[in-house]
């Protein structure tokens, strides 16, 4: 399977909400013993590999934000912890999964990574990730609402196999 980042850059004004999205697609083993973890974290553009470093998003770790479910089931983080930090991660039946960040500040600017791990019998079989940049702007140069810039075809299949 693969993960596509629909947009490689989001430019938003301070105070806005933004939803960063990844799409998970390709052949999915629908065996009863196969499940998926999907999560989000911040990172930096490493020289060797993007998304190798994991940093929290608003003090929440990738474990706090993870979704666990079978195949293309829908799921979302309902726990208070994420919502108290103005965050919500969600996943739909079509392979889209996202993180919504409310009331953006300049501190939210940076590189964000989505990660999908295929699990069989409690063990990691495959893992893929996608990366996107968020720029939060203030002042007269800031857009009035969020603008998302599409990924190039090469970037949009940002694949890291296990």
């Amino acid at each position: 399977f693969k993960v596509a980042t629909l947009y490689s850059l989001y430019v938003c004004p301070e105070g806005q909400n933004v939803t960063l999205t990844c799409r998970f697609f390709g052949p999915v083993d629908k065996g009863h013993d196969v499940t998926f973890y999907k999560t989000w974290y911040r990172s930096s553009r490493g020289e060797v590999q993007t998304c190798s470093e994991r940093r929290p998003i608003r003090n929440l770790t990738f474990q706090d934000l993870h979704l666990h479910h079978g195949g293309h089931q829908a799921a979302n983080t309902s726990h208070d912890l994420a919502q108290r930090h103005g965050l919500e991660s969600a996943s739909d039946h079509h392979g889209n999964f996202s993180i919504t960040m409310r009331n953006l500040t300049l501190l939210d600017s940076g590189l964000y990574c989505c990660l999908v791990v295929e699990i069989r019998h409690h063990h990691s079989e495959h893992r893929v990730h996608g990366a996107m940049e968020l720029q939060v702007q203030t002042g007269k140069d800031a857009p009035s609402s969020c603008v998302a810039y599409p990924s190039s075809s090469q970037e949009s299949e940002n694949i890291t196999a296990a």
């Epitope: 990738f62 474990q63 979704l67």
Partner: antibody, heavy 123, light 112 residues
């Protein structure tokens, strides 16, 4: 510190069901899995299965598949293991254990264990 | 199911002497992802099991460095470089590579 506290000893009749609880504290409940292992008197250890608290997904040893149910209550950080159609061979100490995994959700060990719950099946 | 066979089943040791426990699996326990999920647990008398070693050779935090694990494929060994009185109990190997996960029958270590 990490603690798994299990419910007290039970005596059941053959054919009945038993529900053992395991209350977790000292860590974030949804960041780890919970496994169940049993030990018959004077015998070795036998793995029964596990549950993923964040989703409720569980996977069981085929030997117990038709008789075991693992559930969780995230509001109280408690996992339950129910075993039905009890027979004398089910007399054992039942342990819950925390399943640790790495940054890619890959299990590597049962790192902390409960104190055990003795279930006696006798007519 | 994978059968884990330990030897010896009983191991009398003099304090300060080394000890070695063998664990053999009925088939390879190398997982398809390349990892080998072989663990060692110690159950002291009247207590719950406790983790010693995971993924063949990694010592769990707080486990003394006199404990070491090694092996590959189907043959694994737990070594105690210098046995102490507190090491008495039953040692179990455990494979978590193939469902159902299975324990060895246990090796009882006692002080001579």
């Amino acid at each position: 510190q990490v603690q798994l506290v299990q419910s007290g000893a039970e005596v059941k009749k053959p054919g009945a069901s038993v529900k053992v609880s395991c209350k977790a504290s000292g860590y974030t409940f949804t960041h780890y899995t919970i496994h169940w292992v049993r030990q018959a008197p004077g015998q070795g250890l036998e793995w029964m299965g596990y549950i993923i608290p964040s989703s409720g997904y569980s996977e069981y040893n085929q030997k117990f598949k038709d008789r075991v149910t693992m559930t969780r209550d995230t509001s109280t950080s408690t996992v339950y293991m129910e075993l039905s159609s009890l027979r004398s061979e089910d007399t054992a100490v039942y342990y819950c254990a925390r399943g640790a995994y790495d940054d890619y959700y890959d299990y590597y060990a049962m790192d902390y264990w409960g104190q055990g719950t003795l279930v006696t099946v006798s007519s | 199911d994978i059968v884990m066979t330990q030897s010896p089943l009983s191991l009398p040791v003099t304090p300060g002497e080394p000890a070695s426990i063998s664990c053999r699996s009925s088939q390879t326990i190398v997982h398809s992802n390349g990892n080998t999920y072989l663990e060692w647990y110690l159950q002291k008398p009247g207590q719950s099991p406790q983790l010693l070693i995971y993924k063949v050779s990694n010592r769990f935090s707080g486990v003394p460095d006199r404990f070491s694990g090694s092996g590959s494929g189907t043959d694994f060994t737990l070594k105690i470089s210098r046995v102490e009185a507190e090491d008495v109990g039953v040692y179990y190997c455990f494979q978590a590579s193939h469902v159902p996960w299975t324990f060895g029958q246990g090796t009882k270590l006692e002080i001579k």
